[in-house]
């Protein structure tokens, strides 16, 4: 999504279909307050950003309220009146769902059902990753609602779990971002634990989209 008109790199993140964040990195203009102008409809006049992000005292991005909009964002980054980067992008291609909240665990013998509050929009995958101290890497299971049952767990082992949400690639495209992970919680024999004892340093979980 970068694009490099006059050496300007941009990044777009559409947080939870609520707020669009457009940030730029323009080494040529590093000490300049670039301005951000945008519209959601190709026929409208441009509005100027009212909520800038600052880095070292200079503009580096803009936050826009854009609740549940399946729109194209037309925007122009300018140095005074001179456009240094102009583009249009479908906002939903850069969706980042919010982190799962209210994660709940229901145990039944060697299985656990993990639930959380479903987000208000669809075409998402809810991924649970889990591991015991004896596992060399994280196991993963995902469903299209936040109701994921994992079977075949060893009742005597302590397991760490966390959950995230991903946008379906066939709906939103390949450039979305997974949500941040939920808190890690540790469980043994259906009881919560502060940590899983003798846990080796966990390998980094698979972060593939």
């Amino acid at each position: 999504q970068g694009g490099a008109a006059e050496g300007v790199q941009i990044q777009i993140i559409y947080f939870n279909l609520e707020t669009v964040q457009v940030t730029w990195n323009a080494s040529k203009y590093s000490r300049t307050n670039l301005t951000f102008h945008y519209r959601f409809n190709g026929d409208e006049a441009y509005d100027q950003c009212t909520n800038y992000l600052l880095q070292e005292g200079h503009t580096s991005g803009c936050l826009l309220d854009a609740e549940q909009r399946d729109d194209i964002l037309y925007f122009s980054i300018r140095n005074g009146t001179h456009p240094v980067f102009t583009a249009s992008r479908w906002m939903v291609y850069y969706l980042k769902p919010s982190s799962p909240k209210h994660v709940r665990f229901s145990w039944h013998q060697d299985a656990v059902t993990v639930t959380c509050s479903d987000l208000s929009y669809g075409d998402l995958l809810y991924e649970v990753q889990y591991r015991s101290p004896f596992d060399t890497e994280w196991q993963s299971k995902q469903e299209n609602t936040c109701n994921v049952t994992i079977e075949g767990l060893d009742a005597e082992k302590c397991y760490s779990f966390w959950v995230r949400v991903k946008a379906m690639e066939d709906v939103y495209g390949p450039d979305t971002y997974p949500s941040d992970w939920s808190e890690v919680t540790c469980w043994q024999r259906g009881e919560i634990r502060d940590a899983c004892a003798e846990t080796p340093t966990p390998p980094k979980p698979k972060l593939s989209k």
Epitope: F15, N16, E18, T19, S98, S99, K101, H102, R104, F105, S106, W107, S117, D180, E183, I192
Partner: antibody, heavy 121, light 107 residues
């Protein structure tokens, strides 16, 4: 030291909008996993959970009041706000804000002292 | 909504007693049950979360237990400072709901 303090108008009339502020210190609402919520208690009665806002601006509302409630935050000023539109005498209560930290399974570990709100014509 | 019922709206006990306060949920809440103490001046404190986990700084004379729909808070060696109203709260499903409270009084 974690502290929360609620403030509000004290008295307002039916059909007006109630605006409450929770000012807190000792923690940041930008910390991952952190949340702040509102609970109310009519005099001599039980507690009713109203709304909750999270570090990433996710919001939860009690469905029975959702159409009346708006929760918001100003992370830099360590404040959380609750608006209740079209209040009635049934909204007369003490309003508390409370913190939900990481690791307590959605329990609220610190509460403010409460602010009393009376709705009367 | 899940209804939380505290059958006893008040209890009286003597200092030094062991007191048990019960709470029942209208459906299985998988131990997602918290206990709060409200002093007469309105101050609210978390005592126990997730059925039995003692919040930091809470005296060890407080303990919690239960599963499914039935839960209890036990206070051993009741002290004067424990005179308060105790509320249970389920956080298993939204909306989070509270019991009606049990007021603890000295005999």
């Amino acid at each position: 030291q974690v502290t929360l303090k609620e403030s509000g108008p004290g008295i307002l009339k039916p059909s007006q909008t109630l605006s409450l502020t929770c000012s807190f210190s000792g923690f940041s609402l930008s910390t991952s996993g952190m949340g702040v919520g509102w609970i109310r208690q009519p005099s001599g009665k039980g507690l009713e959970w109203l709304a909750h806002i999270w570090w990433d601006d996710d919001k939860y509302y009690n469905p029975s009041l959702k159409s009346q409630l708006t929760i918001s935050k100003d992370t830099s000023r360590n404040q959380v706000f609750l608006k209740i539109t079209s209040v009635d005498t049934a909204d007369t209560a003490t309003y508390y804000c409370s913190r939900r930290p990481r690791g307590t399974m959605d329990a609220m570990d610190y509460w403010g002292q409460g602010t009393s709100v009376t709705v009367s014509s | 909504d899940i209804v939380m019922t505290q059958a006893a709206s008040s209890l009286s006990a003597s200092l030094g007693d062991r007191v048990t306060i019960s709470c029942r949920a209208s459906q299985d809440i998988s131990k997602y049950l918290n206990w709060y103490q409200q002093k007469p001046d309105g101050t609210v404190k978390l005592l126990i979360y997730y059925t039995s986990r003692l919040h930091s700084g809470v005296p060890s004379r407080f303990s919690g237990s239960g599963s499914g729909t039935d839960y209890s808070l036990t206070i051993r060696n009741l002290e004067q400072e424990d005179i308060a109203t105790y509320f249970c709260q389920q956080v298993y499903t939204l909306p989070w709901t509270f019991g009606g409270g049990t007021k603890l009084e000295i005999k």
